[in-house]
Each structure stands twice: as structure tokens, then as C-alpha cells.
Amino acid sequence: ALDTNYCFRNLEENCCVRPLYIDFRQDLGWKWVHEPKGYYANFCSGPCPYLRSADTTHSTVLGLYNTLNPEASASPCCVPQDLEPLTILYYVGRTPKVEQLSNMVVKSCKCS
Amino acid sequence: ALDTNYCFRNLEENCCVRPLYIDFRQDLGWKWVHEPKGYYANFCSGPCPYLRSADTTHSTVLGLYNTLNPEASASPCCVPQDLEPLTILYYVGRTPKVEQLSNMVVKSCKCS
């Protein structure tokens, strides 16, 4: 699986999840998030060669098409597969609010 | 929606579904598919600017991160959203077989 366990431990050129730390204030300009100050959102990148973690029959076919027709511009792309939530603390006026934001952290990738 | 109705009628640089006809024999080297001779598989391509058909909270955050940090290499990617099946005819020996292949035709795209 192209997950953090594998990808963070290997120098992988092809589609894999990559570490990306986002500081809410510095990187997004968000002052409203009180805690955490930032988090590992991660992202997916890298080429999708033939048969690499193909998501659907279409991505399998497109991967073969791209392999046999290298001049073609159509190829699968490396995108998030499994995502996890992130719990944040923010304030509405002086009232603290705890919210679980869904699909905030990429844990694995696929070729789609 | 970034679907064939919109994308095929507009000169759209950003993420959209693009027409791609695949000839089974010429493009994939598949002699085994008897009918059809080929089909419009289509594909997704184009940049994913901030808020363009974002798939998840992560892709929204990543789009904003990319907009505010243009030097960053992390950005959402344009990939299939809705796919449709394709019915094919092939032979096993002299016996004709009709099969509906799922997820073969891209009808719309998203930024993921």
C-alpha cells in the first residue's frame, strides 16, 4: 500500500504520500484556529507507471495506453486514497469550540 | 459540474474532462475485444486552482496552501469523479461472451 508506513521510509520516486506540515497561521493565514498550531496534512505526488496502485479499470486502461503510447498526454494521477480527520480548537467570541474536521490528513495514495 | 456537457463545449484550461478515443487494437494492442472496436474513455487534465471542484477538505486546504505559497510543489490533481461502464463482446474459444466492464468511461472530473 502506498501509505505513510511505506512511503515515509523509502526513497520512492513514483506515486506515494509525502510529508507536508501546514502551519495554520503562517501557511494559510488562519488566525482563527487556536489549537493545534499546525498539522501534517501530507500530499500525494509522483508518476503513475503501468499497474501502480490503479484505482479503477479506467486508470488501469489509461496506464497501459500511456505505456504503449508514450507521446500521449493522458495518464493517471497520484491522489489521496485514505484520509483521516483532525480535531481543532477555535473560539466563537469567548466560547471554545472543539470540532473534528473530516478528510484533513492524507494517509495513503492511489493512481486515479 | 466538470462534466462532458460543460467541458466538451468550452475551451477550459483548468481541470476538466477531455475526449480520448481508444482503439482497442491500435492503441492497446488488444485483439481479444471483438466489439466495439474502440470507445471514448476520456481523461481528466488541467490545473486545480483554489476552490475548483474540490473533492475533500484536504483538497480545499491544499488548494489554499498552493495559492498562498506558489513555490510549493503540493497541489490538488484533476482526476475522474463519475465513471460509466462499457459493454464489450469477446470470445472464449468459439463461444461469444458479453461483459459489462465497470468504470471504463470518465464522465466528470474533480480536484483531489
Epitope: L51, A54, L64 | R25, L28, G29, W30, W32, Y90
Partner: nanobody, 118 residues
Framework: EVQVVESGGAAVQPGESLRLSCAAS????????MGWFRQAPGKQREMVAI???????NYADSVKGRFTISRDATKNTVYLQMNSLNPGDTAVYYC????????????WGQGTQVTVSS
Amino acid sequence: EVQVVESGGAAVQPGESLRLSCAASGSIFNTATMGWFRQAPGKQREMVAIITDGGRTNYADSVKGRFTISRDATKNTVYLQMNSLNPGDTAVYYCNALTIVPRSSIYWGQGTQVTVSS
């Protein structure tokens, strides 16, 4: 049950040749795109060559001009002829069969070891 079985791996010297064979179940062979992949110690599995039922082929840049993939439908077998072998070709070689009927599936063999050393 679908089976993919490789054979022909051996230890050879640089410059020598070797032919690998891969037998696949007849139930899938005629519709399958067959491929040879390899995995060297500490490296990722990479594509070496593929061949479709219609004879379309593609090779990794590192083996172009040295390796040839072919298939024999009468024997449900795919071959990889490897010439001018060098130490960089040392790896476990895996055969696979991609078929999309009745559903999209990839079948892998167990692998065969090729070692090139003087």
C-alpha cells in the same frame, strides 16, 4: 484457479544470455496483457517489458535492445529473452497477467532469481 508460474532463473556471468518462461492459466491467457517486472535488493519492483495479446510491446529504457518479450498462445506461455546481461540486471523477475474480464485483476507469479556476477 488462475496461476502464473515463472521459470528459467539462474546465475550467469556478465555478457551471457538467459531465457525466462512464464506459464499462465489458459482461462485468462488469451485476454491477458502479460508483463515481466523485476525487483533488485532494496529497490522497488519495476516494469521490464509487457506484451499484449495482439503483440504490442513496451520495454524499460534500461533493457531496450537487449531483452525481447514474446508470447506463444498455443502454450499459454510468455518468454523473456535476455542478452548481454550485466550485474545491474540482478533481481527477482516476476511475471504478471493483467485481465479486465470478467473483472479487472492482476495475477502475479512467485518470481525467479536472476544473478549476474563474475
